[in-house]
């Protein structure tokens, strides 16, 4: 198809040919194309490319063009030719090709697809039902992220209340650039009656830790010491905690936040993998206290989607005073 | 107690470089990130970037990014903030300050005096 | 990227006072990152308030945070002659440009 243009059109260069588009995995689109036909021989070749909605521009030598995109829509690429790198000038008549999404109901999809990675060692993904589908629908999960060789069908699939899910391991490798990739997910039935529906989940973003665990409360004067086991596989800098304290006398509820830090007090036991220490300043040791604590990860590691841990299990120390 | 004491002043002519520094003590300097704020002469506060002195990972807002450089040296608890080539409008003063995992910066340097100026 | 917008950007107020400042987010934001801070002239900022509500270590407790999503607020409940400075909040990347209380 070509796209004529006024502001498009140059005498110079021809358009490119046999643009083509083709999906790999579950949403990475790929375009190709061939160099223009009787391109003049003094030009130095570059391909000028956009999306339909004029977005992504992109001035490159490659004949190809590739996106990680949810396909729940139509996506068209305009791709032109020209003779430099400057996007000032006019590129060759623009030629597009679109590729849509799978048919089916729009009604029939799934809807509130949405994925969390859980302490980095699992993906738990949870829908709704389309309104257009039976009670009785057997949905599949399929997903996708670069350490797999190939789209892989998730097996645990579970029912919440009105939500259907799955869950498949996902831990997270050493290799740095492990988190900048993402996972492809995409949800249709079996019997291929609803229209599938697609999502795309960043490695960096909805990750939820396990909660901590307590694991020790002492007193020492009038300070209470909180020890706690912290959740694998996160590295130090990527996780912050809130103390939670209640006093039963006072009814106070006093939160900390606190960095991962060190037990070096000799009111603590040191050394032990993994643990973090916290002293909560002037605590009554002859009232009843109780602590809980939960973890949410930094925004610097993990885009902030307001996901803190569940909440520890609750610890108490000191004595419940008897109401006179 | 918590301090992080910056280098002094510095006058310097446009395109020469300049390292200044941020020496932290009274905590553990390789669990808490240190972060640099810029502020121009009657103007706003702007981050600039921080580090983790613990594993030297450095994230840079995309006004500073390729910009400056923000490194750390743990064995002497100290961060620094250069530039290769100084230009006029990087006269302002520099803050450092430290960031627990919140964000936020909870304690701060006394300031490095910047003026770039031929 | 998020722009924090802080209103008024100057208030003018007595001693005994109280004063209302806001910040506006242009998009959601976790409280747990939105911190406030002090300037003095020829001074360091300071930290008062981080996690939204949560008081910075020796803050006055007439310094108090409050707000979620998009809307928070720095309420200083009787100005004192030492509260006459600029406020900024932060998240994370992003300062406001800051509002100037200044003595009536």
């Known amino acids: 198809d070509y796209k004529d243009d006024d502001e498009s059109r140059t005498e110079t260069q021809p358009p490119v040919t046999n643009l083509s588009v083709s999906v790999e995995n579950l949403c990475t689109v790929i375009w190709t194309w061939n160099p223009p036909e009787g391109a003049s021989s003094n030009c130095s070749l570059w391909y000028f490319s956009h999306f339909g909605d004029k977005q992504d521009k992109k001035i490159a030598p490659e004949t190809r063009r590739s996106i990680e995109v949810p396909l729940n829509e139509r996506i068209c690429l305009q791709v032109g030719s020209q003779c430099s790198t400057n996007e000032s000038e006019k590129p060759s008549i623009l030629v597009e090709k679109c590729i849509s999404p799978p048919e089916g109901d729009p009604e029939s999809a799934v809807t509130e697809l949405q994925c969390i990675w859980h302490n980095l060692s699992y993906m738990k993904c949870s829908w709704l039902p389309g309104r257009n589908t039976s009670p009785d629908t057997n949905y599949t999960l399929y997903y996708w992220h670069r350490s797999l060789e190939k789209i892989h069908q998730c097996e645990n699939i579970f029912r919440e209340g009105q939500y259907f899910g799955c869950s498949f391991d996902l831990t997270k490798v050493k290799d740095s650039s492990f988190e900048q990739h993402s996972v492809q997910i995409m949800v249709k039935d079996n019997a291929g009656k609803i229209k599938p529906s697609f999502n795309i989940v960043p490695l960096t973003s909805r990750v939820k830790p396990d909660p901590p665990h307590i694991k020790n409360l002492s007193f020492h004067n009038d300070d209470l010491y909180v020890q706690w086991e912290n959740p694998q596989n996160f590295i130090s800098r990527c996780l912050f905690y809130e103390v939670e304290v209640n006093n039963s006398q006072t009814e106070t509820h006093n939160v900390f936040y606190v960095q991962e830090a060190k037990c070096e007090n000799p009111e603590f036991e040191r050394n032990v993998e993994n643990t973090s220490c916290f002293m909560v300043p002037g605590v009554l040791p002859d009232t009843l206290n109780t602590v809980r604590i939960r973890v949410k990860t930094n925004k610097l590691c993990y885009e902030d989607d307001k996901l803190w841990s569940n909440w520890s299990q609750e610890m108490s120390i000191g004595k419940k005073r008897n109401s006179t | 107690e918590v301090q992080l004491v910056q280098s002094g002043a510095e006058v310097k002519k446009p395109g020469e470089s300049l390292k200044i520094s941020c020496k932290g003590s009274?905590?553990?300097?390789?669990?808490?990130?240190i972060g640099w704020v810029r502020q121009m002469p009657g103007k706003g506060l702007e981050w600039m970037g921080v580090i983790y002195p613990g594993d030297s990972y450095t994230r840079y807002s995309p006004s500073f990014q390729g910009q400056v450089t923000i490194s750390a040296d743990k064995s002497i608890s100290t961060a620094y903030l250069q530039w290769s080539s100084l230009k006029a409008s990087d006269t302002a003063m520099y803050y450092c300050?430290?960031?627990?995992?919140?964000?936020?910066?909870?304690?701060w340097g006394q300031g490095t005096l910047v003026t770039v100026s031929s | 990227e998020i722009v924090l917008t802080q209103s008024p950007g100057t208030l003018s107020l007595s001693p005994g006072e109280r004063a209302t400042l806001s910040c506006r987010a242009s998009q959601s934001i976790s409280s747990s990152y939105l911190a406030w801070y002090q300037q003095k002239p020829g001074q360091a900022p300071r930290l008062l308030i981080y996690?939204?509500?949560s008081r910075a270590t020796g803050i006055p407790d007439r310094f108090s945070g409050s707000g979620s999503g998009t809307d928070f607020t720095l309420t200083i409940s009787r100005l004192e002659p030492e509260d006459f400075a600029v406020y900024y909040c932060?998240?994370?990347?992003?300062f406001g440009q800051g509002t100037k209380v200044e003595i009536k």
């Open positions: 932060q998240q994370y990347e992003t």
């Open positions: 996690g939204a509500s």
């Open positions: 009274g905590y553990s300097f390789t669990s808490y990130w």
């Open positions: 300050a430290r960031m627990p995992n919140w964000g936020s910066f909870d304690y």
